[in-house]
C-alpha cells in the first residue's frame, strides 16, 4: 500500500504462486509389476507430501501397459485427501507389453491439456515409473523431444525387480529410463532394487519435484 493506504500494484505472496505444479504420474501397470500394493504404497507416500488443490499442486495419473488409461485428470480432485483415496483404488490393468513411449506421449498430448485440468503458465511435471524395457522404445526419441518442446520436466524411475528376480542384465533398461529423464539426469532419474523399495525414494523425489517450484 502507499502512504495514503491506497493499494498499489500488488505482488501475490511468493508461497502462493510457487506452490503451483501440474504433476502427471505415468504408471507402468503391465503384468510384470508385482506386487501392485507397493506401487499404491509409493503413490500414497508421495501424494501425502503434496498440497493438492485447484490453486496449489494438481495431480493426474495415467496407467499404461499395452494401452493407456487416464485414472484421473489433473482437475478431478481438489484436496490431498481426495487424491489419496482415489490413488488407493487404482487397480493394476495389466498387459503383456510395456508401451512406455505411448504412455508418455498420451500424458503429454492428453493429460496435460486444459480440458483435463492443466493450467496455463503452470510448470508441468511428469513422473514415469516402469519396470522394464519398452516394446516401443524405437518411438522414445520423438516422444521425449516433444516433451522437451513443451517444457515438461520428467522424473523417471526404473524398478529393477523383474530383472533381479530373473538374474538379467539391467544395463539396457537403465539406459532407456535414463534417456527419459530430464537433464541433469542424476537429479531426475532414480532406480530401485524392486517394487517394495519404491517407498525409499519418496522423500528425495518429493524434494526434487518441489525444488522446481522455486
Amino acid at each position: 500500500v502507499s502512504p495514503t493506504f491506497q493499494v498499489v500494484n500488488s505482488i501475490a505472496p511468493v508461497q502462493e504462486c510457487s506452490t503451483q505444479l501440474d504433476i502427471v504420474i505415468v504408471l507402468d501397470g503391465s503384468n510384470s509389476i508385482y506386487p501392485w500394493d507397493s506401487v499404491t504404497a509409493f503413490l500414497n507416500d508421495l501424494l501425502k507430501r503434496m498440497d493438492i488443490g485447484p490453486k496449489q499442486t494438481q495431480v493426474g495419473i495415467v496407467q499404461y501397459g499395452e494401452n493407456v488409461t487416464h485414472e484421473f485428470n489433473l482437475n478431478k480432485y481438489s484436496s490431498t485427501e481426495e487424491v489419496l483415496v482415489a490413488a488407493k483404488k487404482i487397480v493394476q490393468r495389466g498387459g503383456r507389453q510395456t508401451m512406455t513411449a505411448l504412455g508418455i506421449d498420451t500424458a503429454r498430448k492428453e493429460a496435460f491439456t486444459e480440458a483435463r485440468g492443466a493450467r496455463r503458465g503452470v510448470k508441468k511435471v511428469m513422473v514415469i515409473v516402469t519396470d522394464g524395457e519398452s516394446h516401443d522404445n524405437h518411438r522414445l526419441k520423438k516422444v521425449i523431444q516433444d516433451c522437451e518442446d513443451e517444457n515438461i520436466q520428467r522424473f523417471s524411475i526404473a524398478i529393477l525387480g523383474s530383472y533381479n528376480r530373473g538374474n538379467l542384465s539391467t544395463e539396457k533398461f537403465v539406459e532407456e529410463i535414463k534417456s527419459i529423464a530430464s537433464e541433469p539426469t542424476e537429479k531426475h532419474f532414480f532406480n530401485v532394487s524392486d517394487e517394495l523399495a519404491l517407498v525409499t525414494i519418496v522423500k528425495t523425489l518429493g524434494e526434487r519435484i518441489f525444488a522446481l517450484e522455486a
Epitope: E66, N67, V68, R96, Q97, M99, L102, D105, T106, H135, D136, H138, R139, K141, K142, Q145, D146, E148, D149
Partner: antibody, heavy 117, light 108 residues
Framework: QVQLQESGPGLVKPSQTLSLTCTVS??????????WSWIRQHPGKGLEWIGY???????YYNPSLKSRVTISVDTSKNQFSLKLSSVTAADTAVYYC?????????WGQGTTVTVSS | EIVLTQSPGTLSLSPGERATLSCRAS???????LVWYQQKPGQAPRLLLY???SRATGIPDRFSGSGSGTDFTLTISRLEPEDFAVYYC?????????FGGGTKVEIK
C-alpha cells in the same frame, strides 16, 4: 509444405552398394518431432520398412536388413541417406523416403532401383 | 515381428457401395500405433488414418476406421471413383514396423 525427393542411381550391379539420398524441402530435418524413414516396394508387391533415423543420428533398422543397411543424416544439407550393401536382384524395388510422426504423412515420389549386371 | 494379414485380397465393388477392409494382427497392437494408407498405381502411398480411427489432414469423412487388439477395420462408406486403389494397414508400435499385404479395391 514439406516435400521429399529421392535421388540416386537407378541401376546398381550385384554385390555393390546401393546409395540413395532424400532431400527435405519446406521444413527442417532438425525439428525433432519426426523420424525419417526408408521404405521399399518390390515390383507388384507390398511395402517393406527398411529403417529410420532421428535428427540426432539415432537409427532403427529392420532386422531382416540390418546387417546390410546404413541410414545417415546430414542436417546441414537437410538430407538423409540410405546405403544398402551387397545387393542382389532381390533388392530391385521402388525405394521411398518418408517422414514419420504418427504414421508416414509425407512421402517422396519414389525412385526405381534395378539390380542387374 | 508382428504380422498383419489383410482381407480380402481383392474387393470388387461399384461406385456408391460400401467397402469394408480388414486388418488382423498376429499379436495385440495398440490402436494408437495402427495406421492405414491408400496407394494408387505409380504413386507413393498416402496416409489416410492414424490412431486406427483419426483421419489425416484432407481425408474425406467417408473414410473411417475402427478396431482394437488384433482386429482393425477400414470402412469407405460410399465409394467414389477416385477411391479405387490398394489399401495397406501398418503398425509402428513394435519394431520392425510392418505393413499388411494390402487389399485392392477394384471397380466391379
Amino acid at each position: 509444405q514439406v516435400q521429399l525427393q529421392e535421388s540416386g542411381p537407378g541401376l546398381v550391379k550385384p554385390s555393390q552398394t546401393l546409395s540413395l539420398t532424400c532431400t527435405v524441402s519446406g521444413g527442417s530435418i532438425s525439428r525433432g518431432n519426426y523420424y525419417w524413414s526408408w521404405i521399399r516396394q518390390h515390383p507388384g508387391k507390398g511395402l517393406e520398412w527398411i529403417g529410420y533415423i532421428f535428427y540426432s543420428g539415432s537409427t532403427y533398422y529392420n532386422p531382416s536388413l540390418k546387417s546390410r543397411v546404413t541410414i545417415s543424416v546430414d542436417t546441414s544439407k537437410n538430407q538423409f541417406s540410405l546405403k544398402l550393401s551387397s545387393v542382389t536382384a532381390a533388392d530391385t524395388a521402388v525405394y521411398y523416403c518418408a517422414r514419420d510422426g504418427y504414421g508416414m504423412d509425407v512421402w517422396g515420389q519414389g525412385t526405381t532401383v534395378t539390380v542387374s549386371s | 515381428e508382428i504380422v498383419l494379414t489383410q482381407s480380402p485380397g481383392t474387393l470388387s465393388l461399384s461406385p456408391g457401395e460400401r467397402a469394408t477392409l480388414s486388418c488382423r494382427a498376429s499379436q495385440s497392437v495398440s490402436s494408437s500405433y495402427l495406421v492405414w494408407y491408400q496407394q494408387k498405381p505409380g504413386q507413393a502411398p498416402r496416409l489416410l488414418l492414424y490412431d486406427a480411427s483419426s483421419r489425416a489432414t484432407g481425408i474425406p469423412d467417408r473414410f473411417s476406421g475402427s478396431g482394437s487388439g488384433t482386429d482393425f477395420t477400414l470402412t469407405i462408406s460410399r465409394l467414389e471413383p477416385e477411391d479405387f486403389a490398394v489399401y495397406y494397414c501398418q503398425q509402428y508400435g513394435n519394431s520392425p514396423l510392418t505393413f499388411g499385404g494390402g487389399t485392392k479395391v477394384e471397380i466391379k
